[in-house]
Interface confidence: low
């Protein structure tokens, strides 16, 4: 009796029909920029305020007949998915609608910009609680639309958008490609990416996560009590907007960075069949389906990290790729990846007062990606220690020498075009965990951080025989901050983090043979924060169940939440 | 059409004095750029978002818009300022001929100009 999509976003171990929260999301206002809506529909009556904002182009075609139910269809359904009495995610959220799409579902970048400006001015005139803006629309890549989204996000507004229904790289569309926006792809009841006619959901590094977006039951504008099934990345985005409203209502002080990290953390991992995506996009596309958090307990103290992929560098010899974290996040490690294996490693460097992750292409390479590990680490003081290529044959080493600083990540960068194999593989001497080691011809960069209660440890997994993929994961309670490969020889394509697992990819076994050159070790740095754990316990001990604890714990409403961007 | 002609006359009269003595060169050392949608059917030529540099005040945005209108009028082009942005991004939305883009890119305070384009329900 519960729609599949609401069941899906409910955390495991709980059933969506066990709780009917009358005020889930009640402290949050959700702005919807879409078509006109049928505000007296039973699903949303009294929950959606239709603003006087309207900026739409004329409908195409001389024979177009304006029919109210068709004009309202898209927006009404989405308002129902966000906050509908029966089929809504955040049944307590109040909404405001702006009309930026005409009766054919078409709008303009300029109309959307003016709508976003209207929201910002409304926020300034009458500041309320947390704001979520749902943008269930897409156009071609737009610098100005992305810039406006960035400004609104930096003003404390959470923007959620559809990845797009073009079965294409979401980075080619706006606002999906804006890094500050939470971009949502669509999956179906079988956790498959949604196919829409000959097209389907967009994918790629600009998608933050997926959510239910096929056969979604919601309010139909055909009558005030009608329901209809609709599909698309708009529906998926509406689920995440609802989850965000639930999370923000429970914890109104959450920043965008914190919200995004929580969305990622509480998502279902590795359930999407990646075969649907083009091969070159699989590694870039997050295998995450949005879900509500089971409760706040156990969330506040965790060290949250996410992986951010850069754009592709392009094939020119000196091409580089840069991956950046959000303003509130710390870059704790940097790695690189090249499908051809021709790369010159990566380094962390300062840019505009913040560390970024830069990967370097090599001659004859098809291009590289930089991969940043971006974490929430309050009061952190991080720096990069570099060791130039070693003179001796033993390899390059660098460690965190400052008192109280721990190693969170290792990077290596080399100028030579082809880093020869280094035999035997350099393994870290036991008892020296705060040390990065690498090839003697590479410079090594250690990310060293001081933060209250931060502790880290190194985990290695070495495979003596050639293998295309070597992984090592952090155990429960620890978070992956760094991921790199030893010895960093030419057959290693690169390393990257997937959730809490470090993945090291190597060239096809058939090309490397079965010599010791095939040996590769995946090195994970796993961290946790005792300070965050302690602060969380103190908070729970000193408050009589405030915020999320009220809603999620006391009421046993185990409901929703979701995650953020790869740019 | 009559309304547009009326607007045009009014603009020429109102702005002729304002354009006198105004430099047309951009601020030194910076070059404004033009952007348009890569998907041709989604382009909406004739309407442009002129984005000004970050710290530009509303009064400067309005002045820049009027300057564009004045310089366009002097060349015999009608322009219409559809909206002046402030609060999120400084700039303005203008309906004008694409012939004026080179001129608009040289205006002071201009960061970049983007041709309007379509967005669609997903």
């Amino acid at each position: 009796s519960i729609p599949w999509n609401l069941e899906r976003i409910t955390p495991p171990r709980y059933r969506a029909d066990e709780y009917q929260p009358p005020d889930g999301g009640s402290l949050v206002e959700v702005y919807l920029l879409d078509t006109s809506i049928q505000s007296d529909h039973r699903e949303i009556e009294g929950r959606v305020m239709v603003t006087d904002f309207e900026n739409v182009p004329e409908e195409d075609g001389t024979r177009f007949h304006r029919q109210a139910s068709k004009c309202d269809s898209h927006g009404t359904h989405l308002a129902g998915v966000v906050s509908g009495r029966d089929a809504g995610v955040a049944k307590g959220a109040s909404m405001r609608s702006l009309r930026v799409l005409n009766c054919q579902g078409k709008g303009t970048v300029s109309g959307t910009l003016i709508g976003l400006e209207f929201i910002r001015k409304s926020q300034l005139v009458q500041p309320v609680g947390p704001l979520v803006v749902l943008l269930p629309l897409a156009g071609g890549y737009s610098r100005v639309l992305n810039a406006a989204c960035q400004r609104l996000a930096r003003a404390g507004v959470v923007l959620v958008t559809a990845a797009g229904n073009f079965r294409d790289d979401a980075c080619l569309y706006s606002p999906a490609s804006a890094p500050e926006v939470i971009t949502v792809g669509a999956t179906n009841a079988q956790d498959q990416p949604v196919t829409l006619g000959t097209l389907g959901t967009n994918f790629g590094r600009c998608v933050d996560l997926f959510a239910p977006g096929e056969d979604i039951i919601g309010a139909s504008s055909d009558c005030s009590t009608c329901f209809v099934s609709q599909s698309g990345t708009s529906q998926a985005a509406a689920h995440v907007a609802g989850i965000a409203a639930m999370m923000l209502s429970a914890e109104p002080e959450l920043t965008l960075a914190e919200l995004r990290q929580r969305l990622i953390h509480f998502s279902a991992k590795d359930v999407i069949n990646e075969a649907w995506f083009p091969e070159d996009q699989r590694v870039l596309t997050p295998n995450l389906v949005a879900a509500l958090p089971p409760s706040t307990h156990g969330a506040g103290w965790q060290l949250f990290c996410r992986t951010v992929w850069s754009a592709h560098s392009g094939p020119t010899r000196m091409a580089t790729a840069v991956a950046r974290c959000a303003p509130d996040e710390e870059l704790l490690s940097c790695s690189s990846f090249s499908r051809s294996g021709k790369r010159r490693g990566e380094r962390m460097e300062a840019q505009g007062g913040k560390l970024v992750c830069r990967a370097h292409n090599a001659f004859g390479g098809e291009g590289v990606y930089a991969i940043a590990r971006c974490c929430l680490l309050p009061q952190a003081n991080c720096s990069v220690h570099t060791a130039p290529p070693a003179e001796a044959s033993m390899g390059t080493r660098v460690h965190c020498h400052q008192q109280g600083h721990v190693l969170t990540g290792c990077s290596s960068h080399w100028e030579v075009e082809d880093l020869g194999t280094h035999k035997p593989p350099v393994l870290r001497p036991r008892g020296q965990p705060n040390q990065c080691v690498g090839h003697r011809e590479a410079s090594i960069h250690a990310s060293c951080c001081h933060a209250p209660g931060l502790e880290c440890k190194v985990k290695e997994h070495g495979i003596p025989a050639p293998q295309e993929q070597v992984t090592v994961a952090c155990e429960e309670g620890w978070t992956l901050t760094g991921c790199s490969a030893l010895p960093g020889t030419s057959h290693v394509l690169g390393a990257y983090a997937v959730d809490n697992t470090c993945v090291v990819r190597s060239r096809d076994v058939s090309t490397t043979g079965s010599t010791s050159e095939g040996a590769v070790t995946a090195v994970a740095i796993c961290c946790r924060s005792r300070h965050l754990a302690q602060a969380s316990q103190e908070l729970q001990g000193s408050t009589s169940g405030s915020g999320l604890n009220d809603i999620f714990e006391a009421q046993k409403i185990e409901w929703h939440e979701h995650h953020h961007h790869h740019h | 059409q009559e309304d547009e002609d009326g607007d045009y006359e009014e603009l020429v009269l109102a702005l002729r004095s304002e354009e006198d003595g105004l430099a047309e060169a951009p601020e030194h050392g910076t070059t404004a750029t033009f952007h348009r949608c890569a998907k041709d059917p989604w382009r909406l030529p004739g309407t442009y978002v002129v984005v000004l540099k970050e710290e530009t005040h509303l009064s400067q945005s309005e002045r820049t818009a009027r300057r564009l209108q004045a310089q366009a009028a002097r060349r015999g082009y009608l322009t219409k300022i559809l909206h002046v942005f402030h609060g999120l991004l400084p700039g303005f939305l203008v309906k004008m001929s694409g012939d004026l883009l080179e001129l608009a890119l040289k205006l002071p305070h201009v960061d970049y100009i983007e041709e309007d384009s379509s967005v669609f329900a997903q």
Epitope: I2, D17, R42 | -
Partner: antibody, heavy 121, light 112 residues
């Protein structure tokens, strides 16, 4: 006037199923959720679940969710509650009650007269 | 689930008496958006269906005499009958609708 009229008393054997009907009149059926509440002899009131007639959505109390099915036929403005795998402790008076479909009106303003279900071997 | 506990479970009183029945919930019933308490009071006479008296903790249902009043917020609620009438002898139930629906165990009001 507004009325909820329930079907007559039933006597069932353990393991059987019972289906109680509740016919609404005097108001728009789709505008009100229909709840089912039962009361064992000499005991208090126990909420079982509800159905929203306009959408067909249901919510069941966890004590009943494996055995209860609530349905409706909007063409005849009637709600149904079927309870399967009956046990002797299911002997009770079963009431239907309506609740206006608005998020602040979570109370039952009109009740059916009750249907007595006796489970006995 | 939210637990509801009523007290007393039974009480004897005379016509004209002022009677108070209390109801406690295991968590707050205050809806933060509407600022309303999702608590209702019902009266049930033997062999009859329950009848709504009070909703939102303190709002009287139309047609209910004004001698019935409800008060309280959060977790503690009270039903007061200011001057008992013969027809008021019945069982009274409180009910929360904040998290699904739960009734109190009932308070039986008998003639002394």
């Amino acid at each position: 006037q507004v009325q909820l009229v329930q079907s007559g008393a039933e006597v069932k054997k353990p393991g059987a199923s019972v289906k109680v009907s509740c016919k609404a009149s005097g108001y728009t059926f789709n505008d009100y959720w229909m709840h089912w509440v039962r009361q064992a002899p000499g005991q208090g009131l126990e909420w079982m679940g509800y159905i929203n007639p306009s959408s067909g959505f249901t919510k069941y109390h966890q004590n009943f969710k494996d055995r209860v099915t609530m349905t409706r036929d909007t063409s005849i403005s009637t709600a149904y509650m079927e309870l399967s795998r009956l046990r002797s402790d299911d002997t009770a008076v079963y009431y239907c009650a309506r609740q206006y479909d608005y998020d602040e009106d979570w109370y039952f303003d009109v009740w059916g007269q009750g249907t007595t279900v006796t489970v006995s071997s | 689930d939210i637990q509801m506990s009523q007290s007393p479970s039974s009480l004897s009183a005379s016509v004209g008496d002022r009677v108070t029945i209390t109801c406690k919930s295991s968590q707050s019933l205050l809806n933060s958006r509407t600022r309303k308490n999702f608590l209702a009071w019902y009266q049930q006479k033997p062999g009859k269906a329950p009848k709504l008296l009070i909703y939102w903790a303190s709002t009287r249902e139309s047609g209910v005499p004004d001698r019935f009043s409800g008060s309280g917020s959060g977790t503690d609620f009270t039903l007061t009958i200011s001057s008992l009438q013969p027809e008021d002898f019945a069982t009274y139930y409180c009910k929360q609708s904040f998290n699904l629906f739960t009734f109190g165990q009932g308070t039986k009001l008998e003639i002394k």
